[in-house]
């Protein structure tokens, strides 16, 4: 079948990195500079993606594959294939239309991206606040107030933490 198709369509013989040039009797011509074809049998080459401004080049364009971009420092990728770059903020901030703004009291963000989230409400779990929250960190909940009352039995220390993926010996 491949052989038959080749006889019918000379373009099917053109490999990736070339295009079937109608202006030259359907000869396979190499893709011009700054263009590529990632599959065989193409009648045109695609323009390479340009990584400029907010984007920077992660992988150069070749005759057979498109360029790949990531974001210039200070910004991070969004979308499939890093289709957009969005501004980083500091921990304790969130990005708004007006740029990076500090988290409101009672909220925190421990990353350079994303939104400020409310501190955990320890009392919902019957616990008390062990460490106060900040703009950058959530509160740390401790034992319930009843556990800390005089005469109460001592708090059982937590079991030693295990590394993720490791089963107990």
């Amino acid at each position: 079948f491949e052989r038959t198709r080749s006889l019918q369509d000379p373009c099917s013989n053109c490999p990736a990195g070339t295009f079937c040039d109608n202006n030259r009797n359907q000869i396979c011509s190499p893709c011009p500079p700054n263009s590529f074809s990632s599959a065989g049998g193409q009648r045109t080459c695609d323009i390479c993606r340009q990584c400029k401004g907010v984007f920077r080049t992660r992988k150069e364009c070749s005759s057979t594959s498109n360029a790949e971009c990531d974001c210039t420092p200070g910004f991070h990728c969004l979308g499939a294939g890093c289709s957009m770059c969005e501004q980083d903020c500091k921990q304790g901030q969130e990005l708004t239309k007006k740029g990076c703004k500090d988290c409101c009291f009672g909220t925190f963000n421990d990353q350079k991206r994303g939104i400020c989230r409310p501190w955990t409400n320890c009392s919902l779990d019957g616990k008390s606040v062990l460490v106060n929250g900040t703009k950058e960190r959530d509160v740390v909940c401790g034992p319930s107030p009843a556990d800390l009352s005089p005469g109460a039995s001592s708090v059982t220390p937590p079991a030693p933490a295990r590394e993720p993926g490791h089963s107990p010996q």
């Epitope: 401004g53 907010v54 969004l78 979308g79 289709s83 957009m84 770059c85 990005l95 239309k97």
Partner: nanobody
């Protein structure tokens, strides 16, 4: 092909003014939020200002508020940045950048930007 081309950069003394322009082509300019971002020598990229599709909302990074003015002319497919009271710390390459689909709603990502124009503030 979607294209943004900045112009208007140059050498200016502290306290001076410059007006940057950005010519847009290959897309419906009036449908998009637009931004100016800058990169100072040896530093990361910094967002400077943005403007809504119809020009009704404009926002600025604190360090340029009151000194820089962003504007647009949808009939001319052009974005502008009027820079007054320039300081040495404004020295940077300035880029115009298009806000991606959904900008201001679900994200603040930019999907196209130009080659940049260089602004040098020095005496």
């Amino acid at each position: 092909q979607v294209q943004l081309v900045e112009s208007g950069g140059g050498l200016v003394q502290p306290g001076g003014s410059l007006r940057l322009s950005c010519a847009a082509s290959g897309f419906t300019f009036s449908n998009y939020w637009m931004n100016w971002v800058r990169q100072a020598p040896g530093k990361g990229l910094e967002w400077v200002a943005n403007i809504k599709q119809d020009g009704s909302e404009k926002y600025y990074v604190d360090s340029v508020e009151g000194r820089f003015t962003i504007s647009r002319d949808n009939a001319k497919n052009s974005l502008y940045l009027q820079m007054d009271s320039l300081r040495a710390e404004d020295t940077a390459v300035y880029y115009c950048a298009r806000g991606g689909e959904g900008y201001g709603e679900s994200h603040y990502g930019m999907d196209v930007s130009g080659q940049g124009t260089t602004v040098t503030v020095s005496s």
